[in-house]
Amino acid sequence: EAHKSEIAHRYNDLGEQHFKGLVLIAFSQYLQKCSYDEHAKLVQEVTDFAKTCVADESAANCDKSLHTLFGDKLCAIPNLRENYGELADCCTKQEPERNECFLQHKDDNPSLPPFERPEAEAMCTSFKENPTTFMGHYLHEVARRHPYFYAPELLYYAEQYNEILTQCCAEADKESCLTPKLDGVKEKALVSSVRQRMKCSSMQKFGERAFKAWAVARLSQTFPNADFAEITKLATDLTKVNKECCHGDLLECADDRAELAKYMCENQATISSKLQTCCDKPLLKKAHCLSEVEHDTMPADLPAIAADFVEDQEVCKNYAEAKDVFLGTFLYEYSRRHPDYSVSLLLRLAKKYEATLEKCCAEANPPACYGTVLAEFQPLVEEPKNLVKTNCDLYEKLGEYGFQNAILVRYTQKAPQVSTPTLVEAARNLGRVGTKCCTLPEDQRLPCVEDYLSAILNRVCLLHEKTPVSEHVTKCCSGSLVERRPCFSALTVDETYVPKEFKAETFTFHSDICTLPEKEKQIKKQTALAELVKHKPKATAEQLKTVMDDFAQFLDTCCKAADKDTCFSTEGPNLVTRCKDALA
């Protein structure tokens, strides 16, 4: 229903704490360079204004849309053009064009320093002094680096952060309590970020229909006992929630997500037997829990899929009468029977089924034509299964770091024109799939691997879109979202690439590498590895292994030497010569 004052309505629904958090996230995601203090000031002004509207919905400007109110605040920031360039042109537009202009200027790779965690004592001191400001800084720093982060989920992670600090800052050894717990939250939040970015990409490029299909498949896997009408209702609501967040309507998004969680908990009987534990939790934890709830037990008496979708004499009639509904039913029925498949695979199968019906229903004898459709799914199913087996075997053999290096070589050969930092970031993220998925039970591996890889490759596509350099990457990124991963997997060495000249300085290292944290050391070595491949794209795995082993030995020796600088300056050039010879 329509409210006299949208801002008063959302403030009342969400409560002051969540309202302020969401407004801070919104501002930080739109204007990513502004400081926390600048945004905090705006948030306070907006909150004070919201309170006046709660007191009197007819007060001046209370009837304005949220985008108008927020946009006016952002456009009033001094030096907007100096700091943000052409984004300032958005302020010449009216709503809703202005908001969509802001959205299109969000930067997926802002030039901000990595979010460094202060040491434990300092963190606990500032947390105890002012928990609200401390958590505000967290929301601001994450939101500006991840401008599409799912806002209500970010509130959940901030709550987790808060609980960890409350617990660990009371311990004697704060460091050993905080580090593993905060590392865990960081890892989960980063995965959440790339997954949500993929959802927004899907909405941006392919629209509501594509996202809703994704939601139907995912929900059908999780809730195989829910009927098609229930799944459709949930998918429609989930699409609306995600669309709102991707569109910058964060207050509406959080409010509607809470409504959806409430609906699910009130209708457990028709949705799933696994929801009660989630439903007992407070709001943010409840919604998070529901989003990753375990699959319900599949009904025992499900008939074979062929009955309604291959053997039925009315297949073409049913399809012609309501194409979207018929295909939606197929996706639902297939997905609920296959929690062991990735959503991407399920969508590829539905697409294959649709193409088959389009072709066969126009022929003289449709049943003879589409009769073999399920058998034709086989190669589509085998391909990702083989991918999982091959890659998990490799991961188990090499460990995470070695597996990342293998992927780095592979992807540098596929797209050597891509910048080395992007290749290293992509390979490190792709390589984490091993740790994340390969240790899971067999029936959970495929969905974990493929849907995670798809999200990471979406980021590769977004970064490449900014500065397109590789025809291979452009080709894979131009197709549909579900075909991207198979496309990247199928890429081979780029034969059009002219190898980079060998530059000694690229492989020259100094003693400062010795004091770097392990992660930074790995990145330095992986940067060198990518550069080696760019110099010799057809180097064999054996040659590259020889060089990298030599390199590791060199670092180990010089970092243990009494005079590190001398060791690096004398042994370094020898290493470069040996590398050149090994790759000759």
């Epitope: 969509e100 909405m203 490029k205 669309k243 991707c246 194409k323």
Partner: nanobody, 125 residues
Framework: EVQLVEFGGGLVQAGGSLRLSCAAS????????MGWFRQAPGKEREFVSA????????VYLDSVKGRFTISRDNAKNMVYLQMNSLKPEDTAVYYC??????????????????WGQGTQVTVSS
């Protein structure tokens, strides 16, 4: 393929009303979003309003809110733009457009795959 044809434009006095119609033929299913854009001489094409086939959700440019109303008739495959209290600054060629996928950004012309040929609206003072 979808074909769009607009009609109903014309010359009107400031403060007057016009009703634009857009006839859609071809496959338009529930996923479609229909939009109205306008282009004044020497200016960029500007978003005016949009409506979803599926749920009838609407959105408007701030300067036309309260004056213009978008509506649809699913059975007839028609979309309408009722324009009241017209102002000289509303003078432009008005285009009907269709986005078959209801993509995220509804004010961006590039997200609409199908366009009508346009109908001229002139508001004299």
């Amino acid at each position: 393929e979808v074909q769009l044809v607009e009609f109903g434009g014309g010359l009107v006095q400031a403060g007057g009303s016009l009703r634009l119609s857009c006839a859609a033929s071809g496959r338009t299913d529930s996923a479609y979003r229909m939009g109205w854009f306008r282009q004044a001489p020497g200016k960029e094409r500007e978003f005016v309003s949009a409506i979803n086939w599926s749920d009838g959700r609407t959105v408007y440019l701030d300067s036309v809110k309260g004056r213009f109303t978008i509506s649809r008739d699913n059975a007839k495959n028609m979309v309408y733009l009722q324009m009241n209290s017209l102002k000289p600054e509303d003078t432009a060629v008005y285009y009907c457009a269709a986005d078959p996928d209801s993509r995220l950004y509804y004010t961006v012309p590039q997200n609409y795959d199908y366009w009508g040929q346009g109908t001229q609206v002139t508001v004299s003072s």
